[in-house]
Each structure stands twice: as structure tokens, then as C-alpha cells.
Amino acid sequence: KSPVFGPQEVSSVEGNSVSIKCYYPPTSVNRHTRKYWCRKGASGRCITLVSSEGYVSSNYAGRANLTNFPENGTFVVNIAQLSRDDSGHYKCGLGINSRGLSFDVSLEVSQGPELPNGTEVYTVDVGRTVTIKCPFKTENAPKTKALYKKIGQTSVLVIDSRNYVNPNYKDRIRLRIPGTGQLIFTVVIDRLRLSDHGLYLCQAGDGSNRDEKNADLQVLEPEPELVYEDLRGSVTFHCALGLEVANVAKFLCRVNSRETCDVVINTLGKRDSAFEGRILLNPQDKDGSFSVVITGLRKEDEGRYLCGAHSDGQLQEGWPIQAWQLFVNEESTIPRSPTVVKGVAGGSVAVLCPYNPKESQSLKYWCLWEGAQNGRCPLLVESQGLVQEQYEGRLSLLQEPGNGTFTVILNQLTTQDAGFYWCLTNGDTRWRTTVEIKIIEGEPNLKVPGNVTAVLGETLNIPCHFPCKFSSYEKYWCKWSNTGCQTLPSQDEGPSEAFVNCDENSRLVSLTLNPVTRADEGWYWCGVKQGHFYGETAAVYVAVEEKKVAGSRYVSPAKADAAPDEKVLDSGVREIENKAIQDPRLFAEEKVVADTGDQAGGSRASVDSSSSEEQGGSSK
């Protein structure tokens, strides 16, 4: 007995479609071997019509496909525009037609139900609205109008002009009789159910003079749109369900193995924990359409997704739905980058963000995912240099290392910085990625003064102590502005006493400002890097005051003050929305930090070698 299983008999009518699902044991060999659908000829040979390797016979061109679902151990053959000629004996199978594992399927395509003459056919998707038009003659204008459903040989009253409504259609049907002169009445059925499918009869009047019109209503399930996305990438489901449900709760759900649909996210605040940090439901437009973005795609995200509308925020019969079949390509063009980056309180992280290397000129963005309600992602920084106010002095987006990767550095970390962040551009939306920042126990590796007050016109020397493990790294100082961090000359001053457990390789690198000017006020970063890969950073704020005492100042960690208070954000934040693909601005207006001035002047010195730290502190 073959372990392949499927429908032994399939019957349909001309013009219809069939979807034949064949099941196989999902062993490693079976999952990857060729799948086929062939037709058995008189000679006993089975001629391939469609296969998983992309072959489609001329007879099936444009109307058939075969899709393998290796995780489920199934493949599906879809055949559209059936004709009587398609009737016959077929096999669905694995391997080679003549000696592989297979299952016999008989397909019978008939002419279809004989419809009475003059029958109007209405083809509508489930959950949508149909308007059935029913003409009548003048003499029947004052008489009763009705719609019946034909079930076998009987006719069941659905609605009439005497206010009768069949309980199966309660609250979703209405009969409209126009003003004088218009010889047509209409029946509108909302939220169509699959059970509404069938033959209907409009009737006006009674007896031999009555007017009758037949209507064949075909209620269809939506065909899933096939969506192929890369592992680690992003997918956007655009859901347009129509104005009728514009004010009804929306949802996205995923069909499970029992063929029920588990809510992934809805507008009532429900969200599947498997999508934490990597999903957004974008607010709907006036027409009721909305979209759901999922980033950081995993293989297990594959499957059938439905979006819909219902007051309960979940799938219910008779409400409009849209369907997708998501495939996640494991041979991804999106490079691996850490999904979790760890940093210590007071320390820093450097996050590597991938982007499509063909779009090097695209604007780069970094936003903070917020889970409240439908999820949102307020923009924190962008490559044009705009930084949200409360991140002033501690956040920077760098174009390096380039060629498909940019870097985001966040320092002065606190436990409040833990969370999910998204890397994105105004270009290819499929390259959106998610990274989680975790704050762990530990001490920052770089030590700088907390707060420095410099005297106008004098010399300021700011030390940055680094441990021996960074001895081979390039050290740098830079002056932060909302357009980046401009590198400054610094002085490697030899051994440091800040790391008592370290040998003579523990050093300090100093920044000297000579003479101090008003323009020198602002944030300075000390950091380490290796080539274009950034490691840890430490930030210090320099305040400039009028000269009180002559002489130069050398600031050591012992004299450091607390960091200055952060500014409070009082403006609206910009967030990801549907326009992300086309609109380089991406998000709604917000207040922007003023540029903190020109780079500092002063003495210049050479810089040491270079580096990037492991995942505690950088994304290398």
C-alpha cells in the first residue's frame, strides 16, 4: 500500500476550480523529492501535467500549479477553468511517475447544474454583499414582492415586502422597493455565508400573472495569495475588506493544524506572544483597509493567514476575509545579524542593521517597538540626523560599515532601554529587521568622567580608561551632534590605574581641548572599534563656564559629577505606517533636537588601533 493519500474521487463543474491536496509521510527524503500530478493514458503511462520542479504542461499553462508544503507533508494541485476534457484518471505522487509513491485520483467534470433560462449569476466572496435585481411589470407594482431560495424541489421564503425575514438571514438582508416608475426591486444580502450559495427566485405578484426571475448565487472562499519572503526579513499583509466593515474590529489570524484560526493580532489589543516585538497593525484608512507588518521572519511563521473583520476580533462565518499563504525562504538574501544584543547599565550597545545593498542611498531609520494596543514604532534616529529629544547625546546612526549594513550606537544604557528595536529604510520594506536589547548585570568597560565643566579659554583634558582586552582596538573620541559623531584627535597616554586587575596594557586615551571655546559645549563619546565595526562607547557631557581661576584643568573620574538631566520629550512621535514604502519621511511630525554646534577646536594627537566588542556591547 502506498503511504501517499488524497481524495479518491473529485467532482466539479465546468468553469470551476479544484484544489487537490495529497498527503505524504514528511520524512527528510519525501519532503525534498519531486512532487507531480500526472494523467493516466490508455497505454498505462502517466503523463506529467505539473510538477514541483516548475514544469507545467501546455494543456495546464496559466491555469494550474503545484505547491509543496514540506512541514505538513502535503502538496496541493490547483486546477482552474475546468472543462469536460479534464475528466479522467490521475495520480499525485512523489519521485518518478512510473515507480514512485503515488495515489490514484479520479476527476469528473460535469456540465454543471441546469439553470433555468434567463438566470442571472452572481459570484461574490464570502462575507461580502450582493444585490439581487428583480424586475417586474407595472400590474405587479402594488403586489407582494418576495425572494425564495430553491432547495431541491421546494422553495423556501427568504424575505418579502410584508416584513417577513427568514431567521437564517436575520439582520443581514433587506428588500428595497423603489419609487413609482421604476419597475425593479432589489434584495441586498450582507455578510454572505457559504451556506447562502444556491439558486434564488425573485417573485412579484401571484397567480399566472406573477413576475419571476432566477438568480444563481455563488459564494466563494477567497483564494489565498501566495507570498514568498526571506528568512529574517519582513512581510506586509495589506487587508482591504470594504467600507461595510470600516468600523468593525479587525484581525489577522493564522490557520492551525486543526484548521481553526488563531489570532495573531487584532484591534482589540490581542497579540500572539510568538510575535512579540516584531509585529505592528497599522491604523486603518478611512476605507477600513489596514496592514500588518511582521519582521524577523522565522521558518515557523510559514502558513495560511487570514485577515478579517468581526466585533469579536476573530474569525466568524459570514464576515469578509482575505487570505495569504506565506512561504519563508531559508536561502535568504538577508544576512544573519544578532536578534539579541546585551549591554550593561551605564554601558553601550552597537547594533548592526542590514539593508538591501542595492539601496545604499536609502534613508536609514531605527525605531522602538511599543506593544500597547496594535503596536507602534516611534522613530528614534534616522540617517539624516534627526534624533528624538530624550536620546540626545546617547544615540547615533552611522552609515558604516556600509555595503548592506549600518550601525546604531546607544549608550548611557538604563534598564528602560531594554526592549525591541526595528532597523528599517525608506527602500525595500522586506529588509526590516528586529533586534532585542537586554540589560544584563555588569560594569561598563570604558570609564569616563560623568560630567565635566570646562573653563572658557583654558585647556581641558578628558580621560577615557579602557581595559587591556581593548589594547589592539582603535580608540577614538568624537563630538556628538544630531547628525552623527565627528571624530576628534585624541592622545593615547599609556597605562591606566582604573583597572586594577589588568596589566600594563590597560590604558587611557585622552581628549584635549585647547583652548576651550563656547562651541565645545556638548556631548563627547569615547569609543573603540575595529575597522568599520564599532564596539563600546562611553559618553561625557562638557559644560563651558566663564573663567574664574587661571590655569588648565585635568579631569579624572574621581572628580566626575553626575550626568546632566535628560530633556523630556513633549512632542508627538513619528511611527511606521503603510506609507513606509514610498514615503521617505515615513512618520508624522515631531520636534527635532537642534544641532549642538561645530566640532571642537584644540590640540590634535594621533589615535591608537581599533575594534568591536562581542555581543555584550556590540553586534559583531
Epitope: 476550480s17 451556506s195 487570505a323
Partner: nanobody, 129 residues
Framework: QVQLVESGGGLVQAGGSLRLSCAAS????????MGWFRQAPGKEREFVAA??????????YYADSVKGRFTISRENAKNTVSLQMNSLKPEDTAVYYC????????????????????WGQGTLVTVSS
């Protein structure tokens, strides 16, 4: 709520025929799946046959042990599914259960009991040798 009521069971001689019917009440099944399972004394419940439909398209599935002998069919107007059993064998003796599901999405493997939402009480078929 959907109720499923089986009928047509009884005692029959080997080689004989029986026709089981399953009537679904409480909800229109214009699209979905209905199936037959059976449980012989001391054995686990097993798949016999199933029928899935949507609009004018129907899919019929059979267990290898009944292929060519049993035929499943559906009468839309009466909301019933029948199982015509020919060439009955003593090993067909079992309680036969009707099962049904209605879903907006295509079903999974029809042989799986978890695929069905509603079950009947069962009807006994005894085939004597």
C-alpha cells in the same frame, strides 16, 4: 449547535449491503466536511470515508480497507451524508460514527479525528459470517 444523528445500522450477512445515513441538524452545511469512522470491539476508532465540498466541487476519501466496496455521498437538500456499504465482511463489524466540521478554510488530513468538530452517537453494524 449541530446535532448529528446516524441511522441504518443493523445485522447483515457477509457479502450483504447496508446504507448508513447521517443527518445534520441545527446548521446548514453548504461547505465543509463530513466523515465516517468506526470502532470495533477492543480496537481504536479508525477512519472509513469522508466527503468535503464547497459549492459545486466535491472530494471523496476512502480508507484502503473499504476502497471499491463503500461509497460516500451527500444529499445537499436534506443536509445528509450516506455511506453505502457493499460486499460487507465480518471485519467490518463495528460501531460507525458520523463526524462533521464546517470551516472557512480548507481542511487538513480528513483521516484525523481532530479535524472534526461534531460527532454522532454511533450506530452498530454487525456482519455475521
Amino acid at each position: 449547535q449541530v446535532q448529528l444523528v446516524e441511522s441504518g445500522g443493523g445485522l447483515v450477512q457477509a457479502g450483504g449491503s447496508l446504507r448508513l445515513s447521517c443527518a445534520a441538524s441545527g446548521r446548514a452545511f453548504s461547505s465543509g466536511r463530513m466523515g465516517w469512522f468506526r470502532q470495533a470491539p477492543g480496537k481504536e476508532r479508525e477512519f472509513v470515508a469522508a466527503i468535503s465540498w464547497s459549492g459545486h466541487t466535491t472530494y471523496k476519501y476512502y480508507a484502503d480497507s473499504v476502497k471499491g466496496r463503500f461509497t460516500i455521498s451527500r444529499e445537499n437538500a436534506k443536509n445528509t451524508v450516506s455511506l453505502q456499504m457493499n460486499s460487507l465482511k465480518p471485519e467490518d463489524t463495528a460501531v460507525y460514527y458520523c463526524a462533521a466540521r464546517q470551516s472557512l478554510v480548507a481542511g487538513g488530513d480528513p483521516r484525523g479525528q481532530s479535524e472534526y468538530d461534531y460527532w454522532g452517537q454511533g450506530t452498530l453494524v454487525t456482519v455475521s459470517s
